[in-house]
């Protein structure tokens, strides 16, 4: 019919939900695309319409809101599944319209199966805990709005397959899981299952997240340059290959950008004419401390190159450091035959 502002398929919102569990999905129009909320739209006489395209089909069809026990329903700007089924997977569209205005967006919904240990194709959020940092908590995510505050759900926490009980340093406290002192052994997948009653039925919400124990800010230091250092001299003859590694250790710092770069005579390698290549490799410790190595390479070094200043620089949120490499031209070894001849008094 008439023109509609189509925001297309919002793949940024790849929604994954577990089979046989309730799901509440807000229309993304009001969250990401329009400058007004549902209440404003509703009071202005706009109607929100939902429809969907099944997986592996092209045909858009209306959502059946007349299923037994109101399995799928709409409430304001939320589409409810109580509960989901595997074949609910597809692209869902919410359209806001009246006679003069129309705007719509689609988003993919994937209903996912889990196994007996809560493993599934679900993309898991990662929660980082600082090692040996004191009490830290994780909270069962994305359960708001499923039941009123008057309902008291039960929450069971699992690590992998096993209920968390009698763990030395991990204590379930309702919606929170407390780590008294996080250790590397606490790395893993944690699942909370929230059970609540509604209209004579029992519903379950399963939420899994990955816990990664990382370096503590208490132990964080500015970058440490292990190489180049004062003990190694890069002595080369013209024509040889010059290889200088810059190896830098970075403490883990949340949201820190770690950088390593070379300067040659105070300039970035890109800004000078010599034929230089730089290769970088990165490795991580178990607590996500980072070691970056940048190898500066000049295939056929000239005597001019051997007089230049080669400095490795490193920067993190903790500070900036630099270290010059000791580069020098190798003094050629005396030619044996000439020396010998001279030694015997030959002319």
């Amino acid at each position: 019919s008439e023109r509609c502002d189509d925001w297309g398929l919002d793949t940024m919102r790849q929604i994954q939900v577990f089979e046989d569990e309730p799901a509440r999905i807000k229309c993304p129009l009001f969250e990401h695309f329009l400058k007004f909320n549902y209440s404003t739209a509703h009071s202005a006489g706009l109607t929100l319409i939902w429809y969907w395209t099944r997986q592996d089909r092209d045909l858009e069809e209306p959502i059946n809101f007349r299923l037994p026990e109101n399995r799928i329903s709409k409430e304001k700007d939320v589409l409810w599944f109580r509960p989901t089924l595997l074949n609910d997977t597809g692209n869902y569209t919410c359209m806001l319209r009246n006679t003069t205005y129309c705007s719509k967006v689609a988003f993919p919904l994937e209903v996912v199966q889990k196994d007996s240990c809560f493993n599934s194709p679900m993309k898991l959020p990662v929660h980082k805990l600082y090692i040996e940092y004191g009490i830290q908590r994780i909270t069962c995510p994305n359960v708001d709005g499923y039941f009123p505050s008057s309902v008291k759900p039960t929450i069971t926490w699992y690590m992998g397959c096993y209920k968390i009980q009698n763990f030395n340093n991990v204590i379930p406290e309702g919606m929170n899981l407390s780590f008294l002192i996080a250790l590397i052994s606490n790395n893993g997948n944690y699942t909370c299952v929230v059970t609540y009653p509604e209209n004579g039925r029992t519903f379950h919400l399963t939420r899994t997240l990955t816990v990664k124990v990382v370096g503590s800010p208490k132990n964080a230091v500015p970058p440490v340059i292990h190489s180049p250092n004062d003990h190694v001299v890069y002595e080369k003859e013209p024509g040889e290959e010059l290889l200088i590694p810059c190896t830098v250790y970075f403490s883990f710092l949340m949201d820190s950008r770690n950088e390593v770069w070379w300067t040659i005579d105070g300039k970035k390698p890109d800004d000078i004419t010599i034929d230089v290549t730089i290769n970088e490799s990165i490795s991580h410790s178990r607590t996500e401390d980072e070691t970056r190595t940048q190898i500066l390479s000049i295939k056929k070094v000239t005597s001019e190159d051997l007089k230049r200043s080669y400095v490795c620089h490193a920067r993190s949120a903790k500070g900036e450091v630099a270290k010059a490499a000791k580069v020098k031209q190798k003094v050629p070894a005396p030619r044996y035959t000439v020396e010998l001849a001279c030694g015997f008094g030959a002319t």
Epitope: E19, D20, Q113, C117, T154, T156, N166, V193, T195, T202
Partner: antibody, heavy 117, light 107 residues
Framework: QVQLVQSGAEVKKPGSSVKVSCKAS????????MNWVRQAPGKGLEWMGR????????HYAQKFQGRVTLTADKSTSTAYMELSSLRSEDTAVYYC??????????WGQGTLVTVSS | DIQMTQSPSSLSASVGDRVTITCSAS??????LNWYQQKPGKAPKLLIH???GLHAGVPSRFSGSGSGTDYTLTISSLQPEDVATYYC?????????FGGGTKVEIK
Amino acid sequence: QVQLVQSGAEVKKPGSSVKVSCKASGYTFTSSWMNWVRQAPGKGLEWMGRIYPGDGQTHYAQKFQGRVTLTADKSTSTAYMELSSLRSEDTAVYYCGEGYLDPMDYWGQGTLVTVSS
Amino acid sequence: DIQMTQSPSSLSASVGDRVTITCSASQGINNYLNWYQQKPGKAPKLLIHYTSGLHAGVPSRFSGSGSGTDYTLTISSLQPEDVATYYCQQYSILPWTFGGGTKVEIK
């Protein structure tokens, strides 16, 4: 709503086997545990084991290990409990019980198995 | 295996009475305790999960409490339809184990 319908009563000879079925409807069969519990006449409840039809994972009580086999047919949403080497003390009502987690939320009506020579 | 001991094994009370059944575990079960109701000739029904969580559709006169090894089921005002045998069950550690049951009758 959730329904678990079990097969009918069985009379078996000592040393033989029995296979009890439990057909599930009203929920996603592959997403919940199916437990098996028995109750001897006039006695209490005894947990035998459980199966997760989604991946076939099973847990058995030590007492029944090697004598009980739990299986599930996803295509028909039916769980089975087979008990072998029957003896007179296996005479009991056998229940299937569905649980999304560990509590058994819903139970079948029970199947009486009588072991008699 | 964890042993579950229920008491009393039977009780008789009047309609409207407050009834308490206790369940003791041989070791701490971290609140992983269910209560089931079984009426004569019927399958058990889940009443309470995780010590105090009322199962959907269960009347609010039923409540559960406890921690560690000791747990309680309370019927605040006994009704004729509550005549049944009540079982506690731990689900802390496999194998799941049940108490011996408490038979509740009306005086």
